[in-house]
C-alpha cells in the first residue's frame, strides 16, 4: 500500500549488521508523486565499487546509486549524509553484506518522503500539446482560445468537424485559411447531396499548402477525400498534387484533414458542386441506343433496341427493345438485360420427313428438311432449307415460315415388273412391282392406292359393302400374311353419282361410271411395298391409243384357281372398243345387245390369253406416264368383261379426274391441307 513517508534501517541497527545478509525494501508512494530518499547514517564496510558490502538504490531498471563506507553530513544544520530524488513513485533499496567483516560496522539509517513532481518540466516528453499546469500530485493540460482539449486530456485541437454541406455548390477551407491551420487537429467535413448527383471537387494548385511528406513519402499533415469505398489522397505538399477536378461518382463525400504537432502551413481551399450522376455509355452488343448522346446523366432514359435477329429475353417473354434509366447510383436500370441472338427453338418435325438436329438454333442458323426418299418428295418446293430469322421463326426463301410438305411419290414401283407369259395368262408378281395394289377381301377384289388417304376402286366392288376391309403391302393373301400386312380402315365410300344402283346387281349390263373412292380413317405410311399410283393428267398426252400397253395386277381367278393366293400380273395392249363388243358374253344375264359400251370404258387384252378376271375388279390398269417414263398412272380400273382370257373393259380414269380431285378436296382433313 503506497505511503507518503517511511524509515529504512539496516539489520540490527544501530548494532553491527550481521555477515552474509541480503535484504531489500520496495518503496511506493501514491501516483503523481516522486520519492525523496535520504540517509542520516551510513557505516558500511568500504570496498572498491562497494563489492563486499553495499546498499543499492534501484528505480525501475536503473541503478540510481550504490553506497558503502562512512559518510558524514556536510551541512551542520542537516543530518543528511546522502540523498536521492526520483520523479517516479516506486523505488527499491537492497542491502548486501559478505561473509566477513574486519571491523564492527553499524549499517545505515534512511528515510523517504513523497515529493511533488513537475510533470510539465521534469520529463523529456512534454505531456501537453499546448499548456501544462502542475499541481501537487499531478498536472492538467489546457488549450489556447478556440482550441479544445481532446478526450485524451493531453492534446488540443480546433473544433473543425461536424459541418455537413448539402447545397449543390459550395466552398470549404482549412481552419484559419489562409492563415496557418491548427496543429494536432483532425477536421472532418461532410458533403451530402441529393441522390443522383455526384460531388465534383475542384482545387487550384496555389490554394493548397500543407506540410510536406517525410523522407519515406508519408504525409505528416494530410487531406483525404472518401466517397463510399473510393479514396482520393492522402494529399500534402506545396501546391495540390492531385487532379484539379475530382469526380467522386458519389453523392456523399467525406473530407478529412489531419495535422500533427509541427509544421503548420496556410492550408487549403476548395470548391465543390453537384453534377447529375453520369452513367457510362456502355457497349451493349447487338443493339442501338436512342437517343444517342456523348454523355448520359441521372434521370436520362434510353431505348435500347436489338438489331435484327436479336432479342431481349426476360423470363419466357422475348422483346426487341427495352428502356433503361440512368439511376442515382450511376448505374443503368435493366443492366442485366442483353440482346441475345433470337432462338428459333427446335424445329418442328414434319410428317414423312425429318430435320437433322441443328448444331445451333440461334439467329442465322440453317437447317434442312428432307423427305423420306424415295417414297416421299417435297411437294411445296423451297428446297427444304430454312434459316433462323430475326422474328424467331424458321424461314424458307420460297415458303416463308410454312413447313415443307412431304407427299408420297406416285407411280414408281421399287422393282419393275418383268413380264413372263403365264390374272389369266399372267405371271406371279411381287407387291414391290405393284405397291399401289390394294386387296379387298369382301368381295374378293382389288383397288389402287392414289395417296395417303384415298383408294380408287370400281363402284361395283363397294356398292354392296360400304365398309370394306382392305390390305396393302402383301404379295400373298393368306390370312396369316394379311395379318402381317397393313390393314386399311375405311372412313367413307364415295361412289360416282353416275353409277346406277340396282336392286339385283348380278343382272347388271351397264357398267358405265364404274368408279368409286374410299376415304381412309388414317394415312397410309409409304414404303417399298406400299406406294400410290399416279392419276392421269388432263392433257391429250393421256389419251390412250390402240396398242398402248398397260399392266394389270390382282388376286383374281387364274387358269387353275378361282382365286390367286400370290399376286399375279400381266401386260396388255389397249384395243378398239369394238373388239370387246365382238366377244360373246360367257354367262349372259341378258341379251348381248343389252350390255352398254361407252367412251368411259377402255377395251384391252386379247393377246396371248392375258386378261383380268373375277376377283381382279377395281385394280389399276397401269400405263407408263408419257411425260415421265419412270412413273405409272392409273389409266383404267378393272371393271367387267365378256369372257376371261379374251378382252376386258376398264373404267377410263382420265374422264373422272375432275370428280376424283373434287371429292378428295371436299373430304380432306385439315392436317392434309
Amino acid at each position: 500500500e503506497p505511503t507518503m513517508y517511511g524509515e529504512i534501517l539496516s539489520p540490527n541497527y544501530p548494532q553491527a549488521y550481521p555477515s552474509e545478509v541480503e535484504k531489500s525494501w520496495d518503496i511506493e508512494v501514491p501516483e503523481g508523486y516522486g520519492i525523496h530518499l535520504y540517509f542520516t547514517h551510513l557505516d558500511i564496510e568500504l570496498s572498491e565499487n562497494c563489492a563486499y558490502d553495499s546498499v543499492q538504490i534501484i528505480s525501475g531498471d536503473t541503478e540510481e546509486g550504490r553506497l558503502c563506507g562512512q559518510r558524514s553530513s556536510n551541512n551542520p544544520h542537516s543530518p543528511i549524509v546522502e540523498e536521492f530524488q526520483v520523479p517516479y513513485n516506486k523505488l527499491q533499496v537492497i542491502f548486501k553484506s559478505d561473509f566477513s567483516n574486519e571491523e564492527r560496522f553499524t549499517g545505515f539509517a534512511a528515510y523517504y518522503v513523497a515529493t511533488d513532481i513537475n510533470e510539465c518540466t521534469d520529463f523529456v516528453d512534454v505531456p501537453c500539446s499546448h499548456f501544462c499546469n502542475n499541481f501537487i500530485g499531478g498536472y492538467f493540460c489546457s488549450c489556447p482560445p478556440e482550441y479544445f482539449l481532446h478526450d485524451d486530456m493531453k492534446n488540443c485541437g480546433v473544433n473543425c468537424s461536424g459541418d455537413v454541406f448539402t447545397a449543390l455548390i459550395g466552398e470549404i477551407a482549412s481552419p484559419n485559411y489562409p492563415k496557418p491551420y491548427p496543429e494536432n487537429s483532425r477536421c472532418e467535413y461532410q458533403i451530402r447531396l441529393e441522390k443522383g448527383f455526384q460531388v465534383v471537387v475542384t482545387l487550384r494548385r496555389e490554394d493548397f499548402d500543407v506540410e510536406a511528406a517525410d523522407s519515406a513519402g508519408n504525409c505528416l499533415d494530410s487531406l483525404v477525400f472518401v466517397a463510399g469505398d473510393r479514396q482520393f489522397g492522402p494529399y500534402c505538399g506545396h501546391g495540390f498534387p492531385g487532379p484539379l477536378n475530382i469526380e467522386t461518382k458519389s453523392n456523399a463525400l467525406d473530407i478529412i484533414f489531419q495535422t500533427d504537432l509541427t509544421g503548420q502551413k496556410k492550408g487549403w481551399k476548395l470548391r465543390y458542386h453537384g453534377d447529375p450522376m453520369p452513367c457510362p455509355k456502355e457497349d451493349t452488343p447487338n443493339s442501338v441506343w436512342e437517343p444517342a448522346k456523348a454523355k448520359y446523366v441521372f434521370r436520362d432514359v434510353v431505348q435500347i433496341t436489338c438489331l435484327d435477329g436479336f432479342e431481349v429475353v426476360e423470363g419466357r417473354v422475348g422483346a426487341t427493345s427495352f428502356y433503361s434509366t440512368c439511376q442515382s447510383n450511376g448505374k443503368w436500370s435493366n443492366s442485366k438485360l442483353k440482346c441475345q441472338p433470337v432462338d428459333c427453338g427446335i424445329p418442328e418435325s414434319i410428317e414423312n420427313g425429318k430435320v437433322e438436329d441443328p448444331e445451333s438454333t440461334l439467329f442465322g442458323s440453317v437447317i434442312r428438311y428432307t423427305c423420306e426418299e424415295p417414297y416421299y418428295y417435297m411437294e411445296n418446293g423451297g428446297g427444304g432449307e430454312y434459316h433462323c430469322a430475326g422474328n424467331g421463326s424458321w424461314v424458307n426463301e420460297v415458303l416463308g415460315p410454312e413447313l415443307p410438305k412431304c407427299v408420297p411419290v406416285c407411280g414408281v414401283p421399287r422393282e419393275p415388273f418383268e413380264e413372263k407369259q403365264r390374272i389369266i395368262g399372267g405371271s406371279d408378281a411381287d407387291i414391290k412391282n405393284f405397291p399401289w395394289q390394294v386387296f379387298f377381301d369382301n368381295p374378293w377384289a382389288g383397288g389402287a392406292l392414289i395417296n395417303e388417304y384415298w383408294v380408287l376402286t370400281a363402284a361395283h366392288v363397294v356398292e354392296g359393302n360400304r365398309e370394306p376391309t382392305m390390305y396393302v403391302g402383301s404379295t400373298s393373301v393368306q390370312t396369316s400374311r394379311l395379318a402381317k400386312s397393313k390393314m386399311l380402315t375405311p372412313e367413307h365410300v364415295f361412289i360416282h353419282p353416275g353409277w346406277k344402283l340396282l336392286e339385283v346387281p348380278e343382272g347388271r349390263t351397264n357398267f358405265d361410271n364404274d368408279i368409286a373412292l374410299v376415304r381412309l380413317k388414317d394415312p397410309v405410311k409409304m414404303g417399298p411395298t406400299v406406294s400410290p399410283i399416279c392419276l392421269p393428267g388432263t392433257s391429250s398426252d393421256y389419251n390412250l391409243m390402240d396398242g398402248d400397253l398397260g399392266l394389270i395386277s390382282g388376286w383374281g381367278r387364274t387358269e387353275k384357281r378361282d382365286r390367286a393366293v400370290r399376286l399375279k400380273a400381266a401386260r396388255l395392249p389397249v384395243a378398239p372398243l369394238r373388239k370387246c363388243k365382238e366377244v360373246k358374253v360367257e354367262k349372259p344375264t341378258a341379251d348381248a345387245e343389252a350390255y352398254v359400251f361407252t367412251p368411259n370404258m377402255i377395251c384391252a387384252g386379247g393377246e396371248k390369253g392375258m386378261d383380268s378376271c373375277k376377283g381382279d375388279s377395281g385394280g389399276a390398269f397401269a400405263v407408263q406416264d408419257p411425260n415421265d417414263k419412270t412413273k405409272f398412272y392409273a389409266a383404267g380400273l378393272v371393271s367387267w368383261g365378256p369372257q376371261c382370257g379374251t378382252y376386258g373393259l376398264y373404267t377410263r380414269v382420265k374422264n373422272y379426274v375432275d370428280w376424283i380431285m373434287k371429292t378428295m378436296q371436299e373430304n380432306s382433313t385439315p392436317r392434309e391441307d
Partner: antibody, heavy 118, light 107 residues
Framework: QVQLVESGGGLVKPGGSLRLSCAAS????????MSWIRQAPGKGLEWVSY????????YYAHSVKGRFTISRDNAKNSLYLQMNSLRAEDTAVYYC???????????WGQGTLVTVSS | DIQMTQSPSSLSASVGDRVTITCQAS??????LNWYQQKPGKAPKLLIY???NLETGVPSRFSGSGSGTDFTFTISSLQPEDIATYYC?????????FGGGTKVEIK
Amino acid sequence: QVQLVESGGGLVKPGGSLRLSCAASGFTFSDYYMSWIRQAPGKGLEWVSYISRSGSTKYYAHSVKGRFTISRDNAKNSLYLQMNSLRAEDTAVYYCARDETDYAYDEWGQGTLVTVSS
Amino acid sequence: DIQMTQSPSSLSASVGDRVTITCQASQDISNYLNWYQQKPGKAPKLLIYDASNLETGVPSRFSGSGSGTDFTFTISSLQPEDIATYYCHQYEDYPLTFGGGTKVEIK
C-alpha cells in the same frame, strides 16, 4: 423339258460351310419363285427356304435362320443355298423345287446329300 | 408354327381298295394345302393343290377335300404304282410345314 439339278453336297465337319447350287433349264427361271426343301435320311420333308422372282423377298425355317442364305442369279438360271455353322441335324438330301404358282411345287430336282459329321 | 398331323403313318391295302389319309392342322389354314407323292429314291410330286384341285396330268383316282383344320386325301382305287409316301403341306403361313408322311403299301 424342265430340269433342276442340285450340286455342292458332300461331307462336312460340324461348324463348317457348304454352298449348294441348283441349275435350272427348260423354263424361264426368272418367272418363278423357288424353294429349298430337305429330307433327313428315313424322315419326312422339311421346308428350308423360299425366294421371290427378283430375289428381294426371302423366308427361312426357324431351324436355319441366321445360318443359311438363299440367293439366285437369274442371268445364270441358278439358285443357291449358302450353309454356314453346319450341325449334325442338318444332314439331309437337299432338293430345290420350282413354285409353279401359289406355293405348289410342281418341279423338283433329284436332290444332293449333305452329311455333317466329325 | 403350324403343326401338320398326318395319319396313319403307314397303311397296307389291296389293289383296288379305297385309301383315305387325313391331315390335321394346328390352326385354321383355309384351303391352303397341297398333297405330294414321293416314291422311294425319287423327288416328291405334286398331286393336289388348294386342298381339292387336281394337278394337270394326275390321275383322277386321286382327290382331296377339306377346309380349315381337317383335310382328307383319297385314292379311290389303289393301284400298284401308287406305292409311295404321301405328304400334306400347308402354305398358310411361314414357315411352310409338311405332315409327317403316310407310307402306303400293297398287301
